[in-house]
Amino acid sequence: AILGRSETQECLFFNANWEKDRTNQTGVEPCYGDKDKRRHCFATWKNISGSIEIVKQGCWLDDINCYDRTDCVEKKDSPEVYFCCCEGNMCNEKFSYFPQMEVTQPTSNPVTPKP
């Protein structure tokens, strides 16, 4: 059973390592994949002394942990590299850090990337 699923056909693309990887630095990435597989968008970034450094954004392969996530939100507490994934076109355009620990109340830190 799948409720209210949104198709992902394209995602915001960004690669901080674009010269070495020989890719574009930024743009829109069409998401390809098998017909029976779902597609997602993702974002990875670092927080260097309070400054947000985007590592990559783009399409992400079918992953059950991305299902039913309409917003790109990292919920892990203090990760080394922040990661989020989501479903829906360009849903990785904005991403946020919203740590949800077992006991303490979460605080939201939304981030709008400026590549």
Epitope: I2, G33, D63, I64, N65, D68, M101, E102
Partner: antibody, heavy 118, light 111 residues
Framework: EVQLLESGGGLVQPGGSLRLSCAAS????????MSWVRQAPGKGLEWVSG????????FYTDSVKGRFTVSRDNSRNTLYLQMNSLRAEDTAVYYC???????????WGQGTLVTVSS | QTVVTQEPSFSVSPGGTVTLTCGFN?????????PSWYQQTPGQAPRTLIY???TRSSGVPDRFSGSILGNKAALTITGAQADDESDYYC??????????FGGGTKLTVLG
């Protein structure tokens, strides 16, 4: 420390029902997809069911479709497997497993034994 | 129906190297199936060894490595030890919320 504790197993007659529970602790339950995997005596592992973070998407192996229902209560940090119309071939140890990005099972419970016999 | 195949059994000498493989009947295994590997000793819950083709799980010794070999996923154990004697299972994530386990490989460490 991540802990997954299954309960609810036992002896049941063919055609009967059981509800398995998996109590999760040591991580933020509502952030991760979850799954059930079983192992019949002397046999290999078999994936049974999976559920997304919200519970909005549920998935089953063909042999249990229409008989088993997976659900989760994110406020209680608990995963469930409602098993109806049980058959002898459902006899197995049932494990709950936490699923992480790239869809792998990163933590496992110790399992609960379900025996279907008359 | 997708069937994931593994060698039913394998033997290795202590200190030797063994490669277990994982294929399926519908084509080639690629990284898009997120192959993962699990070790299980009798009466115990499975232990996660390798995920996402080649990433070692926390606490897993670097004697264990994962890869794609030809059209199969592979688990290589180098410098095999007596306590590596276990059952090893590969899992492929088929997408759309579905996983398929291989039948498992029973690894015997000789001697």
């Amino acid at each position: 420390e991540v802990q997954l504790l299954e309960s609810g197993g036992g002896l049941v007659q063919p055609g009967g029902s059981l509800r398995l529970s998996c109590a999760a602790s040591g991580f933020t339950f509502r952030n991760d997809a979850m799954s059930w995997v079983r192992q019949a005596p002397g046999k290999g592992l078999e994936w049974v069911s999976g559920i997304s973070v919200t519970g909005g998407s549920t998935f089953y192996t063909d042999s249990v479709k229409g008989r088993f229902t997976v659900s989760r209560d994110n406020s209680r940090n608990t995963l469930y497997l409602q098993m109806n119309s049980l058959r002898a071939e459902d006899t197995a140890v049932y494990y709950c497993a936490k699923v992480y990005y790239t869809s792998f099972f990163d933590y496992w419970g110790q399992g609960t034994l379900v025996t279907v016999s008359s | 129906q997708t069937v994931v195949t593994q060698e039913p059994s394998f033997s290795v000498s202590p200190g030797g190297t063994v490669t277990l493989t994982c294929g399926f009947n519908s084509g080639s295994v690629s990284t898009s199936y997120y192959p993962s590997w699990y070790q299980q000793t009798p009466g115990q819950a499975p232990r996660t060894l390798i995920y996402n083709t080649n990433t070692r799980s926390s606490g897993v010794p670097d004697r264990f490595s994962g890869s794609i070999l030809g059209n199969k996923a592979a688990l290589t154990i180098t410098g095999a030890q007596a306590d590596d004697e276990s059952d090893y299972y590969c899992v492929l994530y088929m997408g759309s919320g579905i996983w398929v386990f291989g039948g498992g490989t029973k690894l015997t460490v000789l001697g």
